[in-house]
């Protein structure tokens, strides 16, 4: 029962994590204008992986997509790639794990097959989570570097009367969503891998026992059950109980509207 719960929980945690990775990838607030010197601004800039936006005091927001591919920084392209790989791996992992769930019966699928599928999806979730964490961390590092560079530039060349204030960017909400989501996917993957160990039928090594019958000397050695490594296993060992754990997979998150002056 604990194995089923672990597997189910791992699935749900990974599902939430992957939903978060998708949300973070689509979000526009990867970097937001630093408001340290001016906490309330008439023009507020923020940027995502796919477009940059400007919100005015008037309440209007204008977003413009990055319509160039070659003109974008290599780091941004790398972050995009990492996030997409994370989403793809996570989606495949979810698909595999659905069929691997112990509480779902599909034909005469063996526990050994389910164990392998659980392990596969677990590994996929771990890699997916790592991709998301790596992507977000690369972007964060890029922001930190640019922040200090623009801070240094702010205090140079101000001898004249006219000031040119350079817009500095800091961490946006998407980074935190990405980190948390990546972490959840990673945790979910680890849970799936743990569940896999419990799902795999144990190799029972019975010692050879000699039965001495009168007149004959017969040695009887029962064969041990061995878990198959392939998906299409033909071994017929079945668990006696059927796990009945149910998963709460209809978790909806509603975006909140933030209005700024």
């Amino acid at each position: 029962m604990a194995v089923t719960a672990c597997q189910g929980l791992g699935f749900v945690v990974s599902l939430i994590g992957i939903a978060g990775i998708i949300a973070a990838t689509c979000m526009d607030q990867w970097s937001t204008q630093d408001l340290y010197n001016n906490p309330v601004t008439a023009v507020f800039n923020y940027q995502g992986l796919w477009r940059s936006c400007v919100r005015e005091s008037s309440g209007f927001t204008e977003c413009r997509g990055y319509f160039t591919l070659l003109g974008l920084p290599a780091m941004l392209q790398a972050v995009r790639a990492l996030m997409i790989v994370g989403i793809v791996l996570g989606a495949i992992g979810l698909l595999v794990s659905i069929f691997a769930l112990k509480c779902i019966r599909i034909g005469s699928m063996e526990d050994s097959a389910k164990a392998n599928m659980t392990l596969t999806s677990g590994i996929m979730f771990i890699v997916s989570g790592l991709c998301a964490i790596a992507g977000v961390s690369v972007f964060a590092n890029m922001l930190v570097t640019n922040f200090w560079m623009s801070t240094a530039n702010m205090y140079t060349g101000m001898g004249g009367m006219v000031q040119t204030v350079q817009t500095r960017y800091t961490f946006g909400a998407a980074l935190f969503v990405g980190w948390v989501a990546g972490g959840l996917t990673l945790i979910g993957g680890v849970m799936m891998c743990i569940a896999c160990r419990g799902l795999a039928p144990e190799e029972t090594n019975y010692k050879a026992v000699s039965y001495h019958a009168s007149g004959h000397s017969v040695a009887y050695k029962p064969g041990g059950f061995k878990a198959s490594t392939g998906f299409g296993s033909n071994t017929k060992n079945k668990k006696i109980y059927d796990g009945g754990a149910r998963t709460e997979d209809e978790v909806q998150s509603y975006p909140s509207k933030h209005d700024y002056v």
Epitope: N45, S58, R64, V162, V261
Partner: antibody, heavy 118, light 113 residues
Framework: EVQLQQSGAEVKKPGASVKVSCKAS????????MNWVKQAPGQGLEWIGL????????SYAQKFQGRVTMTRDTSISTAYMELSRLRSDDTAVYYC???????????WGQGTSVTVSS | DIVMTQSPDSLAVSLGERATINCKSS????????????LTWYQQKPGQPPKLLIY???TRESGVPDRFSGSGSGTDFTLTISSLQAEDVAVYYC?????????FGAGTKLELK
């Protein structure tokens, strides 16, 4: 047709308060930020502050901070500006103005004359 | 605060002639996010509220005659009336719409010569 109708002229004594209203019509009141601008006799324009009618968020010019309060009543599409501890240099015409693209004020009220005199 | 400096204080131009009003800001009004200059021009006639002419430094408000045009970027801006008409006699103000507090220039009084 977009219209901003302001309340009538006021005569106040120093130290008193005045509350000017601005009734909006012809557009979605909560969809546009409302600004207040002061114009002293024979002088230029001076920004007092703004209010976001959607959430009531405000931003005031430092000069008026602590003396000005901007509110709104979305049920009657009206914005208010209250100026307290009035002084003689508060004698001016006060305008409400709707903010549009580029933070530009595209529609203005007719103005409310406030005279502070003892 | 961003200081807006208008020049000249007053300007006398003949009918049909070109009128040019300058506005200089103490800080750049160019927003890097959308590459737009947050500068607005208003016209005010005696006893009337101001009227919006140009926003984003060069975008003409709908209904404004095309003889009015705005130009400039960063800190230096210009309002040009290509052929002055009698109804253009007014006071013209530039305004910083980029940073709080939103500040206006002192105004330029345009008169007929």
């Amino acid at each position: 047709e977009v219209q901003l109708q302001q309340s009538g002229a006021e005569v106040k004594k120093p130290g008193a308060s005045v509350k000017v209203s601005c009734k909006a019509s012809g557009y979605s009141f909560t969809g546009y930020t409302m600004n207040w601008v002061k114009q002293a006799p024979g002088q230029g324009l001076e920004w007092i502050g703004l209010i976001n009618p959607y959430n009531g968020g405000t931003s005031y010019a430092q000069k008026f901070q602590g003396r000005v309060t901007m509110t709104r009543d979305t049920s009657i599409s009206t914005a208010y500006m209250e100026l307290s501890r009035l002084r003689s240099d508060d004698t001016a015409v006060y305008y409400c103005a709707r903010m549009n693209y580029g933070n530009a004020m595209d529609y203005w009220g007719q103005g409310t004359s406030v005279t502070v005199s003892s | 605060d961003i200081v807006m400096t208008q020049s000249p204080d007053s300007l006398a131009v003949s009918l049909g002639e070109r009128a040019t009003i300058n506005c200089k800001s103490s800080q750049s009004l160019l927003n890097s996010g959308n590459q737009k200059n947050y500068l607005t021009w208003y016209q005010q006639k005696p006893g009337q509220p101001p009227k919006l002419l140009i926003y984003w430094a060069s975008t003409r408000e709908s209904g404004v005659p095309d003889r009015f045009s705005g130009s400039g970027s960063g800190t230096d801006f210009t309002l040009t009336i290509s052929s002055l008409q009698a109804e253009d006699v007014a006071v013209y103000y530039c305004q910083n719409d980029y940073s709080y507090p939103l500040t206006f220039g002192a105004g330029t009084k345009l008169e007929l010569k």
